[in-house]
């Protein structure tokens, strides 16, 4: 999902320590930044979230807030501290004039300031059938485990807790943080105020139409009667959950955020903190028929972001708009005409559509998976959701052409059994943001903290790229792709896997002098090859064709163009075994694929040769896809021949561990 480069406005104001009365002036040269929502109508000027540096204590936050008030007062400005954050993010929420931003940015401990903005509800019986494996009858949907060990927090509108569908299952907390409704003549009607939240609570855990019929829920009101809330209100809600978790630790927690606003650095940061505290967050991708990376919390990498499909597994159209898409979406789920509790009466039911409904399905599935395996980490849960999804059923023609390759073709489904998936080596594909077109532009794809980066590839629509490589960043490997002169930009594609007790390293061979091409292998005892990458400095690799087939007995070897440096990802993990599988096509083809067989998981995907007519390589589920330039432009010379190279791995250790458990 989103890196650090979301599409939002950023005003960087250089700090100078000339402000009067600053006892703790920031170090010279540091800059605090100001952010605001890129969607103008959603901005809420006059209210600001001041985010302080990570290690700032509550007392320092309070002192900084007081200092801001004092200095503002000296300039004749009134300010009001609305909330002091602690427990999730250090900082405070302040109502003040925008004139004071420059002053506020110079305060000690300030990391960045974000103007508040709006968030919105994302809603406009086949659904249980789609997520249910064939062995369950849809009309008597009896989930294998109803999610009874899990608590699901719902941040939404108020709800009708005495509805027959959810009575006794939802605890309404006393948390409420909502903006005033728009319009002077707005009439609050209880049934309308409760509509969105009641429906979603029913989709998650309702007795008749719910996914996780055993899950208990807690509701927080962050959306008003018009389905509108604020980033700040959502932040305070997330902080409330974190504090509740600390006061009374329970079993696994799932937080459902069926709302979306413009890209928000602070909302994404809060989601990241909560996720790293062991909470599973599930959110709506958004109903804007747009790139989900432009919205929050959909763009937060730690959040499970869900798009909406219909009964035919097609992306949902909602009026002139529809489900969001793109690399920030993790998977899709039923989100059209979903039957659920209606707040019109305690025995009323109605259908609603949207990515909120889709997210509620995934929250329900997550609750059931966590109830069956309470020790699952967020990374393990996400990988399982992806693994058990229906693959390649969505008609990608609905998505804009440039988004098709980035959007996961996955529709959420329950595992055939909620136990016993532990033997599987789980991997997923993570796409970076687009690098941009400048000559030296790069793109970085990262895995989650407890995933291993097992391979790295790159892709460019123009074919102008300089390959990719794995490099260490902050103690973890990342995948970096390089744009080339005249290129329109590149994507880095990371293959992120769950490999307990793994010890992985990257072995590099510089460009070879000899004409045979560059080679690198895993020379350490017990290390196996999981991925190959190649990176070159020249603008065009030309047509040199290295030997495609490896010498017998050399499976742990990457080969590449003589002008490229070759990088081998070599891993040691208990019982890990890998093999190389190649599929070469002598005639030019726009796409060459090779898949790993049943029981093996694709960890590496690369192309041979690395010549410039190859657009790149990427993994789709268990298939390695190599894309080349339009056949008509390459002609039918030998340059058109391309080989897709897959590295397929499995873990005997995981398989044995799983057998011992059964």
């Amino acid at each position: 999902q989103e890196d650090e480069d979301g599409d939002y406005e950023e005003l960087v104001l250089a700090l100078r320590s000339e402000e009067d009365g600053l006892a703790e002036a920031p170090e010279h040269g540091t800059t605090a930044t100001f952010h605001r929502c890129a969607k103008d109508p959603w901005r809420l000027p006059g209210t600001y979230v001041v985010v302080l540096k990570e290690e700032t204590h509550l007392s320092q936050s309070e002192r900084t807030a007081r200092r801001l008030q004092a200095q503002a007062a000296r300039r004749g400005y009134l300010t009001k501290i609305l909330h002091v954050f602690h427990g999730l993010l250090p900082g405070f929420l302040v109502k003040m004039s925008g004139d004071l931003l420059e002053l506020a940015l110079k305060l000690p401990h300030v990391d960045y300031i974000e103007e508040d903005s709006s968030v919105f509800a994302q809603s406009i019986p086949w659904n249980l059938e789609r997520i249910t494996p064939p062995r369950y009858r849809a009309d008597e949907y009896q989930p294998p485990d109803g999610g009874s060990l899990v608590e699901v927090y719902l941040l939404d509108t108020s709800i009708q807790s005495d509805h027959r569908e959810i009575e006794g299952r939802v605890m309404v907390t006393d948390f409420e943080n909502v903006p005033e409704e728009d319009g002077t003549r707005f009439h609050r009607q209880a049934s309308k105020c409760d509509s969105h939240g009641t429906h979603l609570a029913g989709v998650v855990s309702g007795r008749d139409a719910g996914v996780a019929k055993g899950a208990s829920m807690r509701s927080l009101r962050v959306l008003n009667c018009q389905g509108k809330g604020t980033v700040s209100g959502t932040l305070i809600g997330l902080e409330f959950i974190r504090k509740s978790q600390l006061v009374q630790p329970v079993g696994p927690l799932v937080v459902l955020l069926p709302l979306a606003g413009g890209y928000s650095r602070v909302l994404n940061a809060a989601c990241q903190r909560l996720a790293r505290a062991g909470v599973v967050l599930v959110t709506a991708a958004g109903n804007f028929r747009d790139d989900a990376c432009l919205y929050s919390p959909a763009s937060a990498p730690e959040v499970i972001t869900v798009g909406a499909t219909n009964a035919q597994d097609q992306p949902v159209t909602l009026g002139t708009l529809g489900t969001n898409f793109g690399r920030c979406v993790d998977l899709f789920a039923p989100g059209e005409d979903i039957i659920g509790a209606s707040s019109d009466c305690s025995t009323c039911f109605v259908s609603q559509s949207g990515t909120s409904q889709a997210a509620a399905h995934v929250a329900g599935i997550a609750a059931m998976m966590l109830s069956a395996e309470p020790e699952l980490t967020l990374a393990e849960l996400r990988q399982r959701l992806i693994h058990f999804s229906a693959k390649d059923v969505i008609n990608e023609a609905w998505f804009p052409e440039d988004q098709r390759v980035l959007t996961p073709n996955l529709v959420a489904a329950l595992p055939p059994s909620t136990h016993g998936a532990g033997w599987q080596l789980f991997c997923r594909t993570v796409w970076s943001a687009h690098s941009g077109p400048t000559r030296m532009a790069t793109a970085v794809a990262r895995c989650a903290p407890d995933e291993e980066l097992l391979s790295c590839s790159s892709f460019s629509r123009s074919g102008k790229r300089r390959g990719e490589r794995m490099e260490a960043q902050g103690g973890k490997l990342v995948c970096r792709a390089h744009n080339a002169f005249g290129g329109e930009g590149v994507y880095a594609i990371a293959r992120c896997c769950l490999l307990p007790q793994a010890n992985c390293s990257v072995h590099t061979a510089p460009p070879a002098e000899a004409s045979m091409g560059t080679r690198v292998h895993c020379h350490q005892q017990g290390h196996v090859l999981t991925g190959c990458s190649s990176h070159w400095e020249v603008e065009d690799l030309g047509t040199h064709k290295p030997p495609v087939l490896r010498p017998r007995g050399q499976p742990n070897q990457c080969v590449g163009h003589r002008e490229a440096s070759i990088h081998a990802s070599c891993c040691h993990a208990p019982g890990l075994e890998c093999k190389v599988k190649e599929h070469g096509i002598p005639a030019p083809q726009e796409q060459v694929t090779v898949a790993c067989e049943e029981g093996w998981t694709l960890t590496g995907c690369s192309a041979l040769p690395g010549t410039s007519h190859v657009l790149g390589a990427y993994a789709v589920d268990n298939t390695c896809v190599v894309r080349s330039r339009d056949v008509s432009t390459t002609g039918s010379t030998s340059e058109g021949a391309v080989t897709a190279v897959a590295i397929c791995c499995r873990s005997r250790h995981l398989a044995q561990a799983s057998q011992e458990l059964q």
Epitope: Q142, R207, D208, I339, S342, C345, C348
Partner: antibody, heavy 117, light 107 residues
Framework: EVKLVESEGGLVQPGSSMKLSCTAS????????MAWVRQVPEKGLEWVAN????????SYLDSLKSRFIISRDNAKNILYLQMSSLKSEDTATYYC??????????WGQGTSVTVSS | DIVMTQSHKFMSTSFGDRVSITCKAS??????LAWYQQKPGHSPKLLIF???YRYTGVPDRFTGSGSGTDFTFTISSVQAEDLAVYYC?????????FGGGTKLEIK
């Protein structure tokens, strides 16, 4: 397969009592509201009573409230209808039904109760 | 109690015809309305719940519409097996109440 089987009804004297039972199978009984509906021969349907999942909440047709009691035993998957001070106008076929989406989606085959001297 | 009125006790139709049965509530019941089919000697069978949602396994020639006080049940093309009595029932507030039923017969 969802099944609802009512106990045998029969002929009873006016003023006497009778307890109907309905044995459920093929679904998680405790997850559903259950109801009794009756039908006078050649006439329409009349809802009698319903009961929530755990038996803590019941509703009745006003005119029957004082004489009929609906109850359930979730351990045995059985729904009951205790009828007392029976009158000739209680003569009907009694159906037990499961409620889903607040409508009655599965019905028993019905049992005939005749109140006559 | 909410009174449900099915104005036609009988409706005559021909096979293949489209037929609509109406039901009126004495007060607003939102969309909390179900339709049942009952054949002689059989228990009622749920067709439509919440005014317009077809229950599992019900053929798509059966549709329901309406909200508030006025509801309609439609069979788009009558088949021989559709000859039965059709009842509406509100599930807005207890006591649940049924309409008097409409018997569908062939002309």
């Amino acid at each position: 397969e969802v099944k609802l089987v009512e106990s045998e009804g029969g002929l009873v004297q006016p003023g006497s009592s009778m307890k109907l039972s309905c044995t459920a199978s093929g679904f998680t009984f405790s997850d559903y509201y259950m109801a009794w509906v009756r039908q006078v021969p050649e006439k329409g349907l009349e809802w009698v009573a319903n009961i929530n999942y755990d038996g803590s909440n019941t509703s009745y047709l006003d005119s029957l409230k004082s004489r009929f009691i609906i109850s359930r035993d979730n351990a045995k998957n059985i729904l009951y209808l205790q009828m007392s001070s029976l009158k000739s106008e209680d003569t009907a076929t009694y159906y037990c039904a499961r409620e889903k989406f607040a409508a009655m989606d599965y019905w028993g085959q019905g049992t005939s109760v005749t109140v006559s001297s | 109690d909410i009174v449900m009125t099915q104005s036609h006790k009988f409706m005559s139709t021909s096979f293949g015809d489209r037929v609509s049965i109406t039901c009126k509530a004495s007060q607003d019941v939102s969309n909390a309305l179900a339709w049942y089919q009952q054949k002689p000697g059989h228990s009622p069978k749920l067709l439509i719940f919440s005014a317009s949602y077809r229950y599992t396994g019900v053929p798509d020639r059966f549709t329901g519409s309406g909200s508030g006080t006025d509801f309609t049940f439609t069979i788009s093309s009558v088949q021989a097996e559709d000859l039965a009595v059709y009842y509406c029932q509100q599930h807005y507030s207890t006591p649940w109440t049924f309409g008097g039923g409409t018997k569908l017969e062939i002309k």
